[in-house]
C-alpha cells in the first residue's frame, strides 16, 4: 500500500514520541561517535520536517524515501570526515548504495568509554530535572554501543528504565530499589543485543533462507498446535520485521512488529494457548511477551514422521515439486515434535535430510537410498547431548568462575591469535551457559545451551570479522551458520601458533586492583590467564592452576597489606619469577 509520503505515514502510525525515539536510535546506530546534542538536533529537524509532511503530504521532499531523508540528514554532519574517516565516502553515493555503505561501517566494538553508573542521588536529580533528556540519553548510549539492538525492543527497555526511576527515586532507600533493577536491565539488554546480533548476522551473512529456516524451527517449537500455513505466514512477517531492523529501517520495523503482534493476538486460537496474558498487555510489553512466550503443549497423538518423509512413495515427487516448501514442512513437523532439541540441531537434521534427498532422488532406487535417513540423525543428536552432559558436570564441579577459566584455557589454545579482551569476553559468556542452562531438566537443557552458545559464538565471529587474525575462526564462522558450535568444539590446540614473547608488564599489577568489583577483579585474573596460555600454550591444567592459585594469593595478600603498592611491586616480581619457574621457562 503505497503512501504519498512515507515519513508522514510512519509518523502517524507510530506517534511523535516513538517516531522521535526510533529516529534517535537509527542515527546513533549509524553515527556512533557523534555527541548526544548533535543527534538530538538532527532528530528535532527530522521531526519538524515530518510534521510538515503530515500537514501536507505533497509538500516539497515529502515524497522522498526514508533512506534518502535520513541519509541526507546524516551527511550534513560537519565533522563526518574527521570523526569517521572513510565512512564519509558513503555520502558521495546514491541510495540504496549509500545506506548499504552506512550499514557496512557499523562498528560492533566502538571505541567508546565504559558506561559508568553515577551515584543514585545524582541519577535521580537528573531524572527529575529533565526526564525527556534523561531517557533520550539512555536510548542514545545503548544504541551507539549496540548498533544492531532491536529498536522496538529498545523502546520497551526505555519504558522499563523510566518506570524504575519513577518508582525508586521516591523510595525511602533509593539505591536498594534502583540498583537491582538497573543491573537486571543491563544484563537483559546485553543478552537482547547479542540475540539480535545473531539474527542480523544470519540475514546478512547467510541470507533470508537461513533466517527463515531458523524461524520455522523456532516458531514450530513454540506454536506446535499451529498449522504449517499459519507458521509460514508468521515466518514471512517476522522475516520482514527483522530484515527491516537489521537494515536500519527502524520505523518500518517497529510499525510492522506492532502489526504482527496485533495479528498474532487476533488469531490466538489458531496459534497458541499461551498467548492470552501477553495479548492483554500494552503494545511494547505485548510484543516482548510474545517474543518470550513459553512453548505451547504438543498436540496429542502426532503421527510418526517416517510415514510422510521416508515411507511414502511420493517423497521425491513432493520434494521436486517445491523443494523449500517440502523441507519447510519437514522442519515444521520435526520441530513441533522436539521442543527438547536446539534450533541449530533441528536445522542440521533438516540439512542432512535435504542432502540425502538431493543424492537419492537422482539414484536408481530412491526409496532404497533414503530409507535409512533417520539413522543418520542419531550421531547428530547425541553429539550435543554428550557435550552438554560433560560440560554441565564440569560446571557443577567447578562453579562458574573456574568453569569460565577452563573455557578460557580451552579457547585460547584453539585460537590463540584472537585478542585477549575478545577471548576473555567470549569465554566468560560461554561459561555463563552453566548457570543459565545446567539447572534445567534434560528436556530443556539442549535448546537452552546450544542456542545460547550460537549467540555467544556469533559475538566472537562479529568481533573477529572487524580485525581477522585467525583462519580457523574465519572458517568456523563462515562455512555454516548451524555448524559453528560443532566447528569450534572440534578445534584442537593450534600447533602452528608461535608462543607470544614474555612481557613482564603484562603480569604487573597495582593496588588499584583492590578497589575493583569482584567481577572486574575476575576479569583482570582471567586476562592474565589468557596471556599465560598465549605465552605457554603447552602448559598443563595443573601448571596453569598452580600459577592462578599463586596469583589469587598474591592479590589477596597485597590487598590486605599496609603498603599495598610496595607489596604489589615486590611480590609481583617474585610472582613472575615463580610463574616462569612453574611453567618451565
Amino acid at each position: 500500500d503505497a503512501h504519498k509520503s512515507e515519513v508522514a505515514h510512519r509518523f502517524k502510525d507510530l506517534g511523535e514520541e516513538n517516531f522521535k525515539a526510533l529516529v534517535l536510535i537509527a542515527f546513533a546506530q549509524y553515527l556512533q561517535q557523534c555527541p548526544f546534542e548533535d543527534h538530538v538536533k538532527l532528530v528535532n529537524e527530522v521531526t519538524e520536517f515530518a510534521k510538515t509532511c503530515v500537514a501536507d503530504e505533497s509538500a516539497e521532499n515529502c515524497d522522498k524515501s526514508l533512506h534518502t531523508l535520513f541519509g541526507d540528514k546524516l551527511c550534513t554532519v560537519a565533522t563526518l570526515r574527521e570523526t569517521y574517516g572513510e565512512m564519509a565516502d558513503c555520502c558521495a553515493k546514491q541510495e540504496p548504495e549509500r545506506n548499504e555503505c552506512f550499514l557496512q561501517h557499523k562498528d560492533d566494538n566502538p571505541n567508546l568509554p565504559r558506561l559508568v553508573r553515577p551515584e543514585v542521588d545524582v541519577m535521580c536529580t537528573a531524572f527529575h530535572d529533565n526526564e525527556e533528556t534523561f531517557l533520550k540519553k539512555y536510548l542514545y548510549e545503548i544504541a551507539r554501543r549496540h548498533p544492531y539492538f532491536y529498536a522496538p525492543e529498545l523502546l520497551f527497555f526505555a519504558k522499563r528504565y523510566k518506570a524504575a526511576f519513577t518508582e525508586c527515586c521516591q523510595a525511602a532507600d533509593k539505591a536498594a530499589c534502583l540498583l537491582p533493577k538497573l543491573d537486571e536491565l543491563r544484563d537483559e539488554g546485553k543478552a537482547s543485543s547479542a540475540k539480535q546480533r545473531l539474527k542480523c548476522a544470519s540475514l546478512q551473512k547467510f541470507g533470508e533462507r537461513a533466517f527463515k529456516a531458523w524461524a520455522v524451527a523456532r516458531l514450530s517449537q513454540r506454536f506446535p498446535k499451529a498449522e504449517f500455513a499459519e507458521v509460514s505466514k508468521l515466518v514471512t512477517d517476522l522475516t520482514k520485521v527483522h530484515t527491516e531492523c537489521c537494515h536500519g529501517d527502524l520505523l518500518e520495523c517497529a510499525d510492522d512488529r506492532a502489526d504482527l503482534a496485533k495479528y498474532i493476538c487476533e488469531n490466538q486460537d489458531s496459534i497458541s494457548s499461551k498467548l492470552k496474558e501477553c495479548c492483554e498487555k500494552p503494545l511494547l510489553e505485548k510484543s516482548h511477551c510474545i517474543a518470550e512466550v513459553e512453548n505451547d503443549e504438543m498436540p496429542a497423538d502426532l503421527p510418526s514422521l517416517a510415514a510422510d518423509f521416508v515411507e511414502s512413495k511420493d517423497v521425491c515427487k513432493n520434494y521436486a515439486e517445491a523443494k523449500d516448501v517440502f523441507l519447510g514442512m519437514f522442519l515444521y513437523e520435526y520441530a513441533r515434535r522436539h521442543p527438547d532439541y536446539s534450533v541449530v540441531l533441528l536445522l542440521r537434521l533438516a540439512k542432512t535430510y535435504e542432502t540425502t534427498l538431493e543424492k537419492c532422488c537422482a539414484a536408481a532406487d530412491p526409496h532404497e537410498c533414503y530409507a535409512k535417513v533417520f539413522d543418520e540423525f542419531k550421531p547428530l543428536v547425541e553429539e550435543p547431548q554428550n557435550l552438554i552432559k560433560q560440560n554441565c558436570e564440569l560446571f557443577e564441579q567447578l562453579g562458574e568462575y573456574k568453569f569460565q577459566n577452563a573455557l578460557l584455557v580451552r579457547y585460547t589454545k584453539k585460537v590463540p591469535q584472537v585478542s585477549t579482551p575478545t577471548l576473555v569476553e567470549v569465554s566468560r559468556n560461554l561459561g555463563k551457559v552453566g548457570s543459565k542452562c545446567c539447572k534445567h531438566p534434560e528436556a530443556k537443557r539442549m535448546p537452552c545451551a546450544e542456542d545460547y552458545l550460537s549467540v555467544v559464538l556469533n559475538q566472537l565471529c562479529v568481533l573477529h570479522e572487524k580485525t581477522p587474525v585467525s583462519d580457523r575462526v574465519t572458517k568456523c564462522c563462515t562455512e555454516s551458520l548451524v555448524n559453528r558450535r560443532p566447528c569450534f568444539s572440534a578445534l584442537e590446540v593450534d600447533e602452528t601458533y608461535v608462543p607470544k614473547e614474555f612481557n613482564a608488564e603484562t603480569f604487573t599489577f597495582h593496588a588499584d586492583i583492590c578497589t575493583l568489583s569482584e567481577k572486574e577483579r575476575q576479569i583482570k585474573k582471567q586476562t592474565a590467564l589468557v596471556e599465560l596460555v598465549k605465552h605457554k600454550p603447552k602448559a598443563t591444567k595443573e601448571q596453569l592452576k598452580a600459577v592462578m592459585d599463586d596469583f589469587a594469593a598474591f592479590v589477596e595478600k597485597c590487598c590486605k597489606a599496609d603498603d599495598k603498592e610496595t607489596c604489589f611491586a615486590e611480590e609481583g616480581k617474585k610472582l613472575v619469577a615463580a610463574s616462569q619457574a612453574a611453567l618451565g621457562l
Epitope: A546, D549, D550, A553, F554, E556, K557, K560, E570, E571, K574, L575, A577, A578, A581, A582
Partner: nanobody, 122 residues
C-alpha cells in the same frame, strides 16, 4: 604480634623425628616458611623452604632425601620430618617466616622463632 613457636626438640636417636612450628599473629598462608639451623659453634645454615601453599619446596643438599618439609595452613603449622638422622644434624632448629609468598631467588628471612635444640646421639 608475630609469633613462631618451635617444638619437638631434645635428645633423639639416629632415625626419625618430627619438628613442628605453631604460627600466630599473622595470616599464615600469605607467607613462605623455612627451617634454618645452627650447629654448635657454627654459622647459620638454611635447611628447607616451602611456598605459601606447599606447591614449591626446596632443600639444602645436606638434607635432601632425608628431611621433608610440610605445612598445614588450616592449623597455622609448619613441620619438618627428619629421617636417617646423623650426629652432624645436631643443631638449634629455627622456624622462619619469609617476607614473600613464593620461594624464588634468595630467601628473605623476616621473622624468627626462638629455636628448638635437636641433639642426635647414639
Amino acid at each position: 604480634e608475630v609469633q613462631l613457636v618451635e617444638s619437638g626438640g631434645g635428645l633423639v636417636q639416629p632415625g626419625r623425628s618430627l619438628r613442628s612450628c605453631a604460627a600466630s599473629g599473622f595470616t599464615f598462608h600469605h607467607y613462605a616458611m623455612h627451617w634454618v639451623r645452627q650447629a654448635p659453634g657454627k654459622g647459620l645454615e638454611w635447611v628447607s623452604g616451602i611456598s605459601w601453599n606447599g606447591n614449591k619446596i626446596t632443600y639444602a643438599d645436606s638434607v635432601k632425601g632425608r628431611f621433608t618439609i610440610s605445612r598445614d595452613n588450616a592449623k597455622n603449622s609448619l613441620y619438618l620430618q627428619m629421617n636417617s638422622l646423623r650426629a652432624e644434624d645436631t643443631a638449634l632448629y629455627y622456624c622462619v617466616r619469609d617476607s614473600s609468598l613464593f620461594i624464588v631467588g634468595a630467601p628473605t628471612f623476616e621473622h624468627w622463632g626462638r629455636g628448638t635444640l635437636v641433639t642426635v646421639s647414639s
